[in-house]
Interface confidence: medium
């Protein structure tokens, strides 16, 4: 069937539309297009004869139409008047006629809208504002946006005039927002520029800051007033009812007791004509003395001495406060306060007790802080550490050892080799060492103030030959699927390559195996029972190589789900029942049995002689591994039949 499709159906003014013909018959003589829903010679747009390929304009031809050999009609530079129906009249070679009608609609391209307002400065809680979207356009839809969001639902918002007008009743300061309107028709959509609603409000009740109402004589009084207001409020200050100044801030330096009184801030909005006031009462007190801290021991020794800190001066009816590290006192059995809180005693001081300490005297209005006091806690020396950590050196290199021990005052250091004093320095340097420099190197750290001394001994071996290494482990009994194990190849030696073997083979590639620390450490993540192998480490340098004895990893695992044997579940009355339970586990698990939920014996084998049908039921084997903390179990149903009642039954054990 002959049909006409309009592409597009909705056409913007000035654009073009194609009336596309579908199912055009074969063997045509020609065709004509007409404006309207019927064939009317007065409304013919164009005719076309196929034989001559001649197009003939009709009375309705505007010069904007083009006809195609496939009978489709293109209309360009569309005008509003083009809206409507179009009829195609087809004349076949047998002079039989056929008709089809199509249509399209023309819409104007919308202009950019704008917003007009009936009130540019509405007053909060008093005025209404009506926004209108201009211009008025036929067949257009109107939409509104507030802060680029669609309109909220509110009883104070009302749309009218075909949504062209948005009215805000009883405006509030929260209505101060960006408003836009949008016009839409089938062919275009345009949005206006923003209009910001400027709502006049306030002043609200002013707030005076700071909130502090008590001051010390000699301080500066600096009060600031703020009231929410649009436009911003104008401020005035009154002291005890007397006007002082028209500023937002009131500053009075070096106040005295005479400055006590009521301080009023008045906020005024010239546009709304409203005034609001707030009053604060300021009290000025006479100056108390600044406290200070005295100590009974300025250089206490760690873990030996106690220190009593006292807050001076002593004033009757005064509250004393303490701070450590700018925090209030922590709860600690080593911290004790006297009954009047004036003395803070630190029992058995530690190096972490240095402070700073502050005390305070609290009066009616404020707290006076002392200057901070820092304790000089004498401590240490701790066990010295000798670096670097190498123990093996090759002949001809320089040996440079450094010693450090935490200490206050800083430690004095001495070096001994094989028990003999060498020098009183923190660093020991020996150039071009030989095998003779092998020995016990002792660093002695001494604290002259506490009189304490600590030593650390390091064994140094100088040899071209490497020693036989050994493997240390951080976990001798790891649990399967839970623990990691780190093997370390000892000793640490300079210019040495570290190698590893597992069961005599080089390390397999595995994401669970990781080498670190210059290949000196081998870490096995998430160990499994298959990791229970022999591990060997090797060390080598340019002149020698050596391997450690193997270390076998003892992986704790299981218990796995147990197996009860024999597998038979049917027995004849009078047979012996002999069930054995086995579960893979390291170490071997503990076994126990339950029959029909009732605990039996703690053995791996359950034996019942001459069973009867009374022995029917569920037989559960429970296994537990105390080392892994894991348990497992399995249940087996046993059926005992009277002799000869069933073929194929087990004769028992």
């Amino acid at each position: 069937k002959l049909t006409i499709e309009s592409t597009p159906f909705n056409v913007a003014e000035g654009k073009e539309v194609l009336l596309l013909v579908h199912n055009l018959p074969q063997h045509l003589f020609g065709y004509s297009w007409y404006k309207g829903e019927r064939v009317d010679g007065n409304r013919q747009i164009i005719g076309y004869v196929i034989g001559t390929q001649q197009a003939t304009p009709g009375p309705a031809y505007s010069g904007r139409e083009i006809i195609y050999p496939n009978a489709s009609l293109l209309i360009q530079n569309i005008i509003q008047n083009d809206t409507g129906f179009y009829t195609l009249h087809v004349i076949k070679s047998d002079l039989v006629n056929e008709e089809a009608t199509g249509q399209f609609r023309v819409y104007p391209e919308l202009p950019k809208p704008s917003i007009s307002s009936n009130n540019s400065k509405p007053v909060e809680d008093k005025d209404a504002v009506a926004f209108t979207c201009e211009p008025e356009t036929q067949d257009a839809t109107y939409l509104w946006w507030v802060n680029n969001q669609s309109l909220p639902v509110s009883p104070r918002l009302q749309l009218s005039n075909g949504n062209r007008t948005l009215t805000l009743f009883n405006v509030t300061r929260n209505d101060t927002a960006s408003y836009k309107c949008e016009t839409q028709n089938p062919v275009s959509a345009r949005r206006s520029d923003s209009v910001i609603l400027n709502v006049l409000y306030g002043p609200d009740a002013p707030t005076i800051s700071p909130l502090n109402t008590s001051y010390r004589s000699g301080e500066n009084l600096n009060l600031s007033c703020h009231a929410a207001s649009n436009p911003p409020a104008q401020y005035s200050w009154f002291v005890n009812g007397t006007f002082q100044q028209s500023t937002q801030e009131l500053f009075i330096p070096n106040i005295t007791v005479n400055n006590s009184g009521s301080y009023t801030c008045q906020a005024h909005n010239s546009d709304t004509g409203l005034n609001r006031t707030t009053v604060t009462t300021i009290t000025v007190y006479a100056e108390p003395p600044k406290p200070f801290i005295t100590s009974n021991n300025s250089n206490p020794v760690e873990d030996e001495d106690a220190v009593a800190l006292t807050c001076e001066p002593e004033i009757q009816n005064t509250t004393y406060l303490w701070w450590v590290n700018n925090q209030s006192l922590p709860v600690s059995p080593r911290l004790q306060l006297s009954n009047d809180n004036r003395t803070l005693t630190l029992l058995s001081v530690t190096r972490n007790d240095v402070g700073p300490y502050e005390c305070g005297i609290q009066n009616e209005l404020s707290v006076d802080h002392s200057d901070p006091v820092i304790l000089n806690v004498l401590y240490g020396p701790d066990d010295p550490t000798i670096s670097p950590s190498y123990t093996y050196y090759r002949p001809g290199v320089n040996l440079s050892l450094s010693c450090h021990a935490a200490s206050n005052p800083p430690a004095q250091y001495s070096w001994l080799i094989d028990g003999n004093i060498q020098q009183h320095t923190q660093e020991l340097f020996i150039s071009n060492i030989t095998e003779k420099n092998s020995g016990l190197y002792t660093c002695q750290a001494n604290n002259s103030a506490s009189g304490h001394s600590r030593t650390t001994v390091k064994t140094i071996t100088v040899s071209a030959e490497l020693p036989k290494p050994s493997i240390s482990s951080n976990n001798s009994k790891p649990v399967e699927d839970k623990d990691a194990v780190a093997f370390t190849c000892e000793p640490e030696a300079q210019n040495t390559t570290y190698l590893w073997w597992v069961n005599g083979q080089s390390l397999p590639v595995s994401p669970r195996l990781q080498l670190s620390n210059g290949n000196r450490t081998l870490t096995l993540f998430n160990v499994t029972r298959n990791d229970a192998r022999a591990y060997v480490c090797g060390i080598q340098n340019s002149v020698s190589a050596n391997r450690s004895d193997p270390v076998t990893l003892d992986v704790l695992y299981g218990p796995d789900t147990p197996i009860i044997s024999p597998p038979d579940s049917s027995y004849l009355s009078g047979a012996n029942l002999n069930l054995s339970c086995h579960s893979a586990s390291n170490p071997s698990p503990q076994y126990s049995w339950r029959i029909n939920g009732i605990p039996q014996q703690h053995t791996q084998v359950l034996f019942i002689a001459k069973i009867t049908p009374n022995n029917n039921g569920t037989y559960a084997c429970f296994v537990s591994n105390l080392a892994t903390g894991r348990n497992n179990s399995i249940v087996k149903s046993i059926t005992v039949s009277a002799s000869g009642t069933s073929p194929g039954l087990s004769a028992g054990a």
């Epitope: 123990t391 003999n420 095998e435 003779k436 092998s438 020995g439 016990l440 390091k458 071996t461 040899s463």
Partner: antibody
């Protein structure tokens, strides 16, 4: 073969001095500390001291300070022990020894090579 | 000085059995992973011979029936099984500071 060859027995008068020798073969003494040990008849072992033949550094057990003097001559690969102001208390076998020639070792005072000993008898 | 006390002073053990000799130090002779205690055997008329170094390491050429153990202040020399040629005096020696020897233990075989 690594060896320490000690000088023969000495019979000396009380108050006199004696100097015994210890010659190394199979190794160079300047590469090792040389030690001396005293053993009185039917008694235990006492360490006298060590010498570093390379630079002549010495260290003595407090008991032998002033009594013993250790020296070396590394051109002849020999170490010497001299004992002065001899008394009957000095009658003993004196061994020279050294450390760690045949094993990896981590301290200088470790004696795995010993001389056969020099017997010193002090007569009044 | 570190004083080494050996016990017993003398010991008689039947052939094939175990001999155990103890050595106690007046302060620890262990440091940085090593124990600086060594054992010697001295047969009559001969110089001492190194058996064990660093508490538990068997000197090259020494039979495996000799073993050493211990750390800190308490050390032990074990001989098992005892053979006739083991009749000798055994000394412990430390090298943690200036070296000293124990008083010796005389082992006789019956």
């Amino acid at each position: 073969e690594v060896q320490l060859q000690q000088s023969g027995a000495e019979l000396v008068r009380s108050g006199a001095s004696v100097k015994m020798s210890c010659t190394a073969s199979g190794f160079n003494i300047k590469d090792y500390y040389m030690h001396w040990v005293k053993q009185r008849p039917e008694q235990g072992l006492e360490w006298i001291g060590w010498i570093d033949p390379e630079n002549g550094d010495t260290e003595y057990a407090p008991k032998f300070q002033g009594k013993a003097t250790m020296t070396t001559d590394y051109s002849s690969n020999t170490a010497y022990l001299q004992l002065s102001s001899l008394t009957s208390e000095d009658t003993a076998v004196y061994y020279c020894n050294t450390r760690g020639l045949s094993t990896m070792i981590t301290t200088r005072w470790f004696f795995d090579v010993w001389g056969a000993g020099t017997t010193v008898a002090v007569s009044s | 000085d570190i004083v080494l006390t050996q016990s017993p002073a003398s010991l008689t053990v039947s052939l094939g059995l175990r001999a155990t000799i103890s050595c106690r130090a007046s302060k620890s002779v262990s440091a940085s992973g090593y124990s600086y205690m060594h054992w010697y055997q001295q047969r009559p008329g001969q110089p001492p011979k190194l058996l064990i170094y660093l508490a538990s390491n068997l000197q090259s050429g020494v039979p495996a029936r000799f073993s050493g153990s211990g750390s800190g202040t308490d050390f032990t020399l074990n001989i098992h099984p005892v053979e006739e040629e083991d009749a000798a005096t055994y000394y412990c020696q430390h090298s943690r500071e200036l070296p000293t020897f124990g008083g010796g233990t005389k082992l006789e075989i019956k």
